[in-house]
Interface confidence: medium
C-alpha cells in the first residue's frame, strides 16, 4: 500500500476519508491507529461502534472522531485541534476478529499556522502537488479538509 501524505495546520481540523469495498468489508468494524515507526506496532486510537449497525454513530477518543458509512463504504476520521504531536504514521483498518486489514496508510504532518504567528516557518505549497511512490499530498490551508482515498480491493 502506498502512503498518503496529509498536511494540516496546528489548531485546525483534518478530516480523512478512507473508502473501501462495502461488500467485502460488510459487518466489519473500522479502526484508526497510530504506527510506531515504519515496521512498529500500530497503536489503536479509536474504533467504530461495537455494534456494526450503529457504526454511523460518531465515536470519540480525545480529539479524534471516527464514523463509518457502511453503505457508501467510507470511514471518516476527524483529527480536531491538531497539535504538533499528532504528526505521525497512521492506518485506517478493517477489523475481523483479532485480525486487522489495512485500508490505507496515512502520514499526517502538522505545520505551524502562519496566521497564528507572522514569523512562523515557511509554508511552501507547490503549484502542482508533488508525488512520491504514488502517494497524494494534500495541503490543509482551510479550517477543515476532507480527503478521500480510492477503494482498496
Amino acid at each position: 500500500l502506498n502512503t498518503t501524505v496529509l498536511q494540516g495546520m496546528a489548531g485546525q481540523s483534518l478530516r480523512v476519508s478512507c473508502t473501501y469495498d462495502a461488500l467485502k468489508h460488510w459487518g466489519r468494524r473500522k479502526a484508526w491507529c497510530r504506527q510506531l515507526g515504519e515496521e512498529g506496532p500500530c497503536q489503536r486510537v479509536v474504533s467504530t461502534h461495537g455494534v456494526w449497525l450503529l457504526a454511523f454513530l460518531k465515536k470519540r477518543n480525545g480529539s479524534t472522531v471516527i464514523a463509518d458509512d457502511t453503505l457508501a463504504g467510507t470511514v471518516t476520521i476527524t483529527l480536531k485541534n491538531l497539535q504538533a504531536g499528532d504528526a505521525g504514521l497512521y492506518q485506517c483498518q478493517s477489523l475481523r476478529g483479532r485480525e486487522a486489514e489495512v485500508l490505507q496508510k496515512v502520514l499526517v504532518e502538522v505545520l505551524e499556522d502562519p496566521l497564528d504567528d507572522q514569523d512562523a516557518g515557511d509554508l511552501w505549497v507547490p503549484e502542482e502537488s508533488s508525488s512520491f511512490e504514488g502517494a497524494q499530498v494534500e495541503h490543509s490551508t482551510s479550517r477543515n479538509q476532507e480527503t478521500s482515498f480510492p477503494p482498496t480491493s
Epitope: E38, E112, A120, S130
Partner: antibody, heavy 118, light 107 residues
Framework: QVQLVQSGAEVKKPGASVKVSCKAS????????ISWVRQAPGQGLEWMGW????????NYAQKLQGRVTMTTDTSTSTAYMELRSLRSDDTAVYYC???????????WGQGTLVTVSS | EIVLTQSPATLSLSPGERATLSCRAS??????LAWYQQKPGQAPRLLIY???NRATGIPARFSGSGSGTDFTLTISSLEPEDFAVYYC?????????FGGGTKVEIK
C-alpha cells in the same frame, strides 16, 4: 537498519555560514520529516526546526528565523541545515533526528560539532 | 512559548534506589510530552512518549505519568547505566521545547 550519518566537525569565524548534512538510509526518506536539535557545550537541548522530507515544508524556531534554512535532497536521501551570520553562542553540537512527529525520533544522527571562534 | 521546568536539577542516588524526576509546563500540554535520556558524548535516547508510553526497547523500570502541566518520570530501581541527564520535551505547541534537564548522579 535505520541510520542518520552527519557531516564532520566545522570551525567557523563569526559572521560566516555553516551547512551541516544528514544522510539517511534504511527507511523511506520521504515518509518521515527531519528535525534539527542543537546542544551548546554543557547546556540543554534546543529545538531548531523541522522539515518535511515529502515536500520541503518547514517550521523554524522563531529565534533562528531568518538565519536558518533547512532543505532536503530526495535523490540522495539527505537533509541539510544551513545557519548563517554565525555568532559565538552558536557553538554547539547539531543533531538531526528522524520522525514524522517531533519525538518519535527512533533514529538520531551522531551529532556535528560546530565551533564559532575568531 | 511553553516553558518546561525540570526539578531537581541534580539527583544524587545509589544504584537500586528509586528516582523521581519532575517536569512542569507553563501551560497545559495535554499528554504531548516525552522523556529523553542522554549520556555524555551521545545523542538523546527516547524513553517515554505521550507522557506514559514506553518507547521500543526501554526497560520496564522506566515509567512516565501525568497530564496537563505536571509530569513525572520514575525509575523504579536505578541500574548503573541509568546515571545520565534526563530531559522532558513538549510537542503540544510550536515551538517544540525541552526542559533544562535533570542530572541523575551516583551518590
Amino acid at each position: 537498519q535505520v541510520q542518520l550519518v552527519q557531516s564532520g566537525a566545522e570551525v567557523k569565524k563569526p559572521g560566516a555560514s555553516v551547512k551541516v548534512s544528514c544522510k539517511a538510509s534504511g527507511y523511506t526518506f520521504t515518509s518521515y520529516g527531519i528535525s534539527w536539535v542543537r546542544q551548546a557545550p554543557g547546556q540543554g537541548l534546543e529545538w531548531m526546526g523541522w522539515i518535511s522530507a515529502y515536500n520541503g515544508n518547514t517550521n523554524y524556531a522563531q529565534k533562528l528565523q531568518g538565519r536558518v534554512t533547512m532543505t532536503t535532497d530526495t535523490s540522495t536521501s539527505t537533509a541539510y541545515m544551513e545557519l548563517r551570520s554565525l555568532r559565538s553562542d552558536d557553538t554547539a553540537v547539531y543533531y538531526c533526528a528522524r520522525g514524522p512527529s517531533h519525538y518519535y525520533d527512533l533514529a538520531w544522527g551522531q551529532g556535528t560539532l560546530v565551533t564559532v571562534s575568531s | 512559548e511553553i516553558v518546561l521546568t525540570q526539578s531537581p536539577a541534580t539527583l544524587s542516588l545509589s544504584p537500586g534506589e528509586r528516582a523521581t524526576l519532575s517536569c512542569r509546563a507553563s501551560q497545559s500540554v495535554s499528554s504531548y510530552l516525552a522523556w529523553y535520556q542522554q549520556k555524555p558524548g551521545q545523542a538523546p535516547r527516547l524513553l517515554i512518549y505521550d507522557a506514559s508510553n514506553r518507547a521500543t526497547g526501554i526497560p520496564a523500570r522506566f515509567s512516565g505519568s501525568g497530564s496537563g502541566t505536571d509530569f513525572t518520570l520514575t525509575i523504579s530501581s536505578l541500574e548503573p547505566e541509568d546515571f545520565a541527564v534526563y530531559y522532558c520535551q513538549q510537542v503540544s505547541n510550536y515551538p517544540i521545547t525541552f526542559g533544562g534537564g535533570t542530572k541523575v548522579e551516583i551518590k
